[in-house]
Amino acid sequence: MMTGTIETTGNISAEKGGSIILQCHLSSTTAQVTQVNWEQQDQLLAICNADLGWHISPSFKDRVAPGPGLGLTLQSLTVNDTGEYFCIYHTYPDGTYTGRIFLEVLESSVAEHGARFQIP
């Protein structure tokens, strides 16, 4: 039975040209996290493996930085970065937990951070 929950930064917005931290946190389980994948739609952005550490996909390595923690920092944001991002926690014995973040990249300076919310 999967008892854990993933808390994410939720729906967030940021200014074009700026940077943003995508953060997920797995709680309410002592399952061993073997790997966390960060994906945008169907594209793999980065992997954080418990033994091997971070791997950033070559096509994103100029704009994506690992951390803080198991989070991911996106830099030099463009309007094309708007969309859904997923943190995928591979664990045992529980299995896979997925968190969703929606990022909106704005042209103006009215970007505000959304509230945190939980995904069961």
Partner: antibody, heavy 118, light 112 residues
């Protein structure tokens, strides 16, 4: 090489307290769930506590719930077990253990003996 | 709670001969993920336990191939194809498919 070294065991009176430590090296400590397993003299193995990699989640069986507290300091690569209200039946060798490769206790320390007696 | 029952309690063995230990769970230990998290440990006299087998049949690093694990659902077996003197000790099965995670009571293997 993965190394787990327990310390802090000793003789304590019933009702007393003790804090065990487990110093970890040879791996990224902050990436792993960690556990304490005990073995009473001449008896089998019993899981007594486990803690998630971040320290945010813990698990205890009913036999120790409310008396034992597992914690960790990822900056010091150290796992702890605070044992309060100790009873004679808590007398055991206490091992810390780490998962790996899809196994729950892939690596074990050498153990530290806790004796609860008046 | 899932009870893990091992048999026999004691197993006298002859070096070079095969040996088999049974572990039965009180209910299925197939996890929702489809994996069966059943492990075998050997604790030699005066030592810490050591992992032999994980996920029913996978040998851990450095474990000799004379050790093998099998089974499914509730019935599991550890086999030693040819017992060696260094294999003496207490063997434990363990499940962590379900909380609370539980050990079997142990099987003591000794040379005849």
């Amino acid at each position: 090489e993965v190394q787990l070294v327990e310390s802090g065991g000793g003789l304590v009176q019933p009702g007393g307290s003790l804090r065990l430590s487990c110093a970890a090296s040879g791996f990224t400590f902050s990436s792993y769930t960690m556990s304490w397993v005990r073995q009473a003299p001449g008896k089998g193995l019993e899981l007594v506590a486990e803690i998630s990699s971040s320290g945010g989640s813990t698990y205890y069986p009913d036999t120790v719930k409310g008396r034992f507290t597992i914690s960790r300091d990822n900056s010091k690569n150290t796992l702890y077990l605070q044992m309060n209200s100790l009873r004679a039946e808590d007398t055991a060798v206490y091992y810390c253990a780490r998962p790996g490769l899809g196994a729950w206790f892939a690596y074990w320390g050498q153990g530290t003996l806790v004796t609860v007696s008046s | 709670d899932i009870v893990m029952t091992q048999s026999p309690l004691s197993l006298p063995v002859t070096p070079g001969e095969p040996a088999s230990i049974s572990c039965r769970s009180s209910q299925s230990i197939v996890h929702n993920s489809g994996n069966t998290y059943l492990e075998w440990y050997l604790q030699k006299p005066g030592q810490s336990p050591k992992l032999l087998i994980y996920k029913v049949s996978n040998r851990f690093s450095g474990v000799p191939d004379r050790f093998s694990g099998s089974g499914s659902g509730t019935d599991f077996t550890l086999k030693i194809s040819r017992v060696e003197a260094e294999d003496v000790g207490v063997y434990y099965c363990f499940q962590f498919s379900h909380v609370p995670r539980t050990f079997g009571g142990g099987t003591k293997v000794e040379i005849k």
